[in-house]
């Protein structure tokens, strides 16, 4: 089956025809499976020591492992990472804003790996077992 | 500046040259700003009444509003949604798995809107104010 970008899923389901178009299982599975997906991450969560300042933007887009593994005893984890450096605006209270370069870790390659403890079901993981 | 897909950000920063390539502010801002982004959502979080069953996959890819708004008193919220119907495998305990069609809500259009109270800093929102 041809890949359908998710932007089109919503539209295909609401096109006015009486029969609702259904995204087939194969497509659903492929899009849900463990992979590196763009995620918006709070800058101060990555740089907690900078909490008294503000950054613009206050979050950055990073690739992070997420998704399902087809087994509740597996979770989606990064097996390869790489750094990316971004230019942000640092705003100190009442002071002149200035550009800074901050480095973040991105997930490049993801795999399904066993949970350490075979107890908690992780139905859909953001690289962290669901509690 | 040309748009750089995030998959390339990690690679550009690790290309062996001594000078780290930096993603420019304009690009960082554009990718972080409030928009509908693909997110993997736990099926049972959308269908809590089905918690005693299992689904395969256990999560689905949906467009959800996320991102930053340039002001801590704003958050990114859906202003237009649409339904999407997907084919999943429903696995009842000890029973034969069967295909089911489940409908989910996707976020089609997002906007930055004020938080109700102008007190709590929300540096980067997943359509929920950060507490």
């Amino acid at each position: 089956l041809p890949a359908v970008p998710p932007q089109q899923w919503a539209l295909s389901a609401g096109n006015g025809s009486s029969e609702v178009e259904v995204v087939p299982f194969q497509e659903v599975w492929g899009r849900s499976y463990c992979r590196a997906l763009e995620r918006l991450v709070d800058v101060v969560s990555e740089y907690p020591s900078e909490v008294e300042h503000m950054f613009s933007p206050s979050c950055v887009s990073l690739l992070r492992c997420t998704g399902c593994c087809g087994d509740e005893n597996l979770h989606c984890v990064p097996v390869e990472t790489a750094n990316v450096t971004m230019q942000l605006l640092k705003i100190r209270s009442g002071d002149r804003p200035s550009y800074v370069e901050l480095t973040f870790s991105q997930h490049v390659r993801c795999e399904c790996r066993p949970l350490r403890e075979k107890m908690k079901p992780e139905r859909c993981g953001d690289a962290v077992p669901r509690r | 500046l040309p748009a750089v897909p995030p998959q390339q950000w990690a690679l550009s920063a690790g290309n062996g040259s001594s000078e780290v390539e930096v993603v420019p502010f304009q690009e960082v801002w554009g990718r972080s700003y409030c928009r509908a982004l693909e997110r993997l959502v736990d099926v049972v979080s959308e269908y809590p009444s089905e918690v005693e069953h299992m689904f395969s996959p256990s999560c689905v890819s949906l467009l959800r509003c996320t991102g930053c708004c340039g002001d801590e008193n704003l958050h990114c919220v859906p202003v237009e949604t649409a339904n999407v119907t997907m084919q999943l495998l429903k696995i009842r305990s000890g029973d034969r798995p069967s295909y089911v069609e489940l409908t989910f809500s996707q976020h089609v259009r997002c906007e930055c809107r004020p938080l109700r109270e102008k007190m709590k800093p929300e540096r980067c929102g997943d359509a929920v104010p950060r507490r």
Partner: antibody, heavy 116, light 107 residues
Framework: QVQLKQSGPGLVQPSQSLSITCTVS????????IHWVRQSPGKGLEWLGV???????DYDAAFISRLSISKDNSKSQVFFKMNSLQANDTGIYYC??????????WGQGTSVTVSS | AIQMTQSSSSFSVSLGDRVTITCKAS??????FAWYQQKPGNAPRLLIS???SLEAGVPSRFSGSGSGQDYTLSITSLQTEDVATYYC?????????FGGGTKLEIK
């Protein structure tokens, strides 16, 4: 509560200088920047310059040669001095505070007339 | 310097009307943008910062929107006390600059 009180002369002779003091209370000048804005009669708002919380200053290019802004953190005072005033410098001069976003509190304004 | 252009210098409006004032920056100002209200004889009052964030105490009939270079101030149902001049302002880069102002007058 937050207050910015301005003091300064109402009348200035042409070619003379204008000095205004902005005394603040309810917040610290080490946390907030103080901007200066003027409004000529019947005209809009014009940004003149700023004393940032860290002690740096920025000025509009049109005023950089004759404007000076300084401060005394311990006295919670910001000092505005503009030299070589002419008739078209007549207007109301405001100080206003800034932290991360816009200018949220303003002084009452100092009405300045340049005339002999 | 970044130029801020308000489309109309004055508006003749009726009480209860929905009013929309627009402002365009000469370049992207990344939402570092504010709206002020000024009544005769008073200092300006900050209404909205960050393009859409309402200041404490500002009535909810006021709202701001926009991004990039284009920004809008809306008043859903104009009240007598809203008759004033409205200024837009960018604080992305110095010199900070204001729009020319839009004066609301009652018909």
């Amino acid at each position: 509560q937050v207050q910015l009180k301005q003091s300064g002369p109402g009348l200035v002779q042409p070619s003379q200088s204008l000095s205004i003091t902005c005394t603040v209370s309810g917040f610290s000048l080490t946390t907030y920047g103080i901007h200066w804005v003027r409004q000529s009669p019947g005209k809009g708002l014009e940004w003149l310059g700023v004393m940032w919380s860290g002690g740096d200053t920025d000025y509009d290019a049109a005023f950089i040669s004759r404007l000076s802004i300084s401060k005394d953190n311990s006295k919670s005072q910001v000092f505005f001095k503009m030299n070589s005033l002419q008739a078209n410098d007549t207007g109301i001069y405001y100080c206003a505070r800034y932290r991360f976003y816009g200018m949220d509190y303003w002084g009452q304004g100092t009405s300045v007339t340049v005339s002999s | 310097a970044i130029q801020m252009t308000q489309s109309s210098s004055s508006f003749s409006v009726s009480l209860g009307d929905r009013v929309t004032i627009t402002c365009k920056a000469s370049e992207d100002i990344y939402n570092r943008f504010a709206w002020y209200q000024q009544k005769p004889g008073n200092a300006p009052r900050l209404l909205i910062s960050g393009a859409a964030s309402l200041e404490a105490g500002v009535p909810s009939r006021f709202s701001g929107s926009g991004s990039g270079q284009d920004y809008t101030l809306s008043i859903t149902s104009l009240q007598t006390e809203d008759v004033a001049t409205y200024y837009c302002q960018q604080y992305w880069s110095t010199p900070w600059t204001f729009g020319g102002g839009t004066k609301l007058e009652i018909k």
